[in-house]
């Protein structure tokens, strides 16, 4: 029978800068029942506080509701593990809510094949930002990424859409059924999960030659951009 091993706070996430949750990994329990508590103080403050809600985020978590969340303060937190033989503390973690935002996936993904008479056919993709995000305040800039692939293909084709909530894609295989998904991230945060897949059947007469595949931004309203490997790496840095 031993004191508990050192716990580790391994993740903090906020869906919208208004609330956030942190999770920890227990260390070894020393063969005894172990209690965990998370304590914190904020930058410029020496008064210590305890986690306000150990329930909402599930086991080994601390949830900070609206009345405990401030964008303008760094939180300095640690977890204490205690059993009959003693205590151990995690390392301190510094948390700035601005940098831990992971939004919900975008909503209302709609995909449509457009075949205008006077122009090349294209796939039109449209979506809405997640409901928890209030873009009107100006606190948020959301960036979007689309991925699509034929149903039986292994590799996804990825397109970066910037801040737009619609996108056009021209280079598709006729007669194939495609899966389309979209995700988002704030300028200083983490990518959301991908939205549920939407399926679209590409008509057999959706044809174009190779010269048509490279189309100017002007033609597309600036909506399709070629992305370098470096860009992709940057957009996936979280």
């Amino acid at each position: 029978q031993l004191p508990p091993g050192k716990p580790e706070i391994f993740k903090c996430r906020s869906p919208n800068k208004e609330t956030f949750t942190c999770w920890w990994r227990p260390g070894t329990d020393g063969g005894l029942p172990t209690n965990y508590s998370l304590t914190y103080h904020r930058e410029g403050e020496t008064l210590m506080h305890e986690c306000p809600d150990y329930i909402t985020g599930g086991p080994n978590s601390c949830h900070f509701g609206k009345q405990y969340t401030s964008m303008w303060r760094t939180y300095i937190m640690m977890v204490n593990a205690t059993n009959q033989m003693g205590s151990s503390f995690s390392d301190e973690l510094y948390v700035d809510v601005t940098y831990i935002v992971q939004p919900d996936p975008p909503l209302e993904l709609a995909v449509e094949v457009k075949q205008p008479e006077d122009r090349k056919p294209y796939l039109w993709i449209k979506w809405s930002p997640p409901t928890l995000i209030d873009l009107k305040t100006g606190w948020f800039t959301l960036l979007y990424e689309i991925r699509l692939k034929p149903e039986k293909a292994a590799e996804w084709e990825i397109h970066f859409a910037g801040q737009q909530t619609e996108f056009k894609i021209l280079s598709l295989h006729p007669g194939q059924k495609y899966l389309v998904q979209v995700r988002c991230k704030p300028d200083h945060g983490y990518w959301s999960a991908w939205s549920p897949a939407t399926f679209i059947q590409i008509p057999s007469d959706f044809t174009m030659n190779d010269e048509q595949k490279l189309i100017s931004e002007e033609d597309l309203g600036g909506e399709q951009k070629l992305i370098s490997e470096e860009d992709l790496h940057h957009h996936h840095h979280h």
Partner: antibody, heavy 118, light 107 residues
Framework: EVHLVESGGGLVQPGGSLRLSCAAS????????MNWVRQTPGKGLEWISH????????YYADSVKGRFTISRDNAKNSLFLQMNSLRAEDTAVYFC???????????WGQGTLVTVSS | EIVLTQSPATLSLSPGERATLSCRAS??????FAWYQQKPGQAPRLLIY???SRATGIPTRFSGSGSGTDFTLTISSLEPEDFAVYYC?????????FGQGTRLEIK
Amino acid sequence: EVHLVESGGGLVQPGGSLRLSCAASGFTFSSYEMNWVRQTPGKGLEWISHISSRSVIIYYADSVKGRFTISRDNAKNSLFLQMNSLRAEDTAVYFCAGITIFGIPEYWGQGTLVTVSS
Amino acid sequence: EIVLTQSPATLSLSPGERATLSCRASQSVSSYFAWYQQKPGQAPRLLIYDASSRATGIPTRFSGSGSGTDFTLTISSLEPEDFAVYYCQQRSSWPITFGQGTRLEIK
């Protein structure tokens, strides 16, 4: 609607003991930091004790340290202050206060009067 | 402990006038700072927290400013119900402390 109702005040002789209670309703008591604050005509408002959501963090003012004990029962939405070795200078109205916004107490009870006199 | 000094001790003004109350801390409290209003026989009522944020239900005529050691509560146009005692408070460090109060009275 939030309610904090203190009870247990009264007249006690110097050296005596009292136990104050605060019954909370209208909010998730178990999530909130709770406090006892007292007010005397001479000293104004004095923050005397603070207890965190699961009693992990407890603070006392030097003027009451070793004599007063704060505790809470989250199952019963209740806050307590056990006051021993009371002195004349402990005479005051005692308020319980719930912290709701970044550690600022927004909810206060109406207070209970404690008089220490022989 | 951090000592808070309020000035003036008493402020005599008429309804409709602007009130400016000051509070100075003996050391920096960042912006962990609040203002309370108290009327006779009542508990203190939170007006401003984090130096400049209005608490729920507080009229817009109340505003707070300052950080570090110097803080101000401004009431832009006094209403009859604003005449009361006002306390500043720091909760940057334990013990949490209050100022001695400013009495705002009708002239």
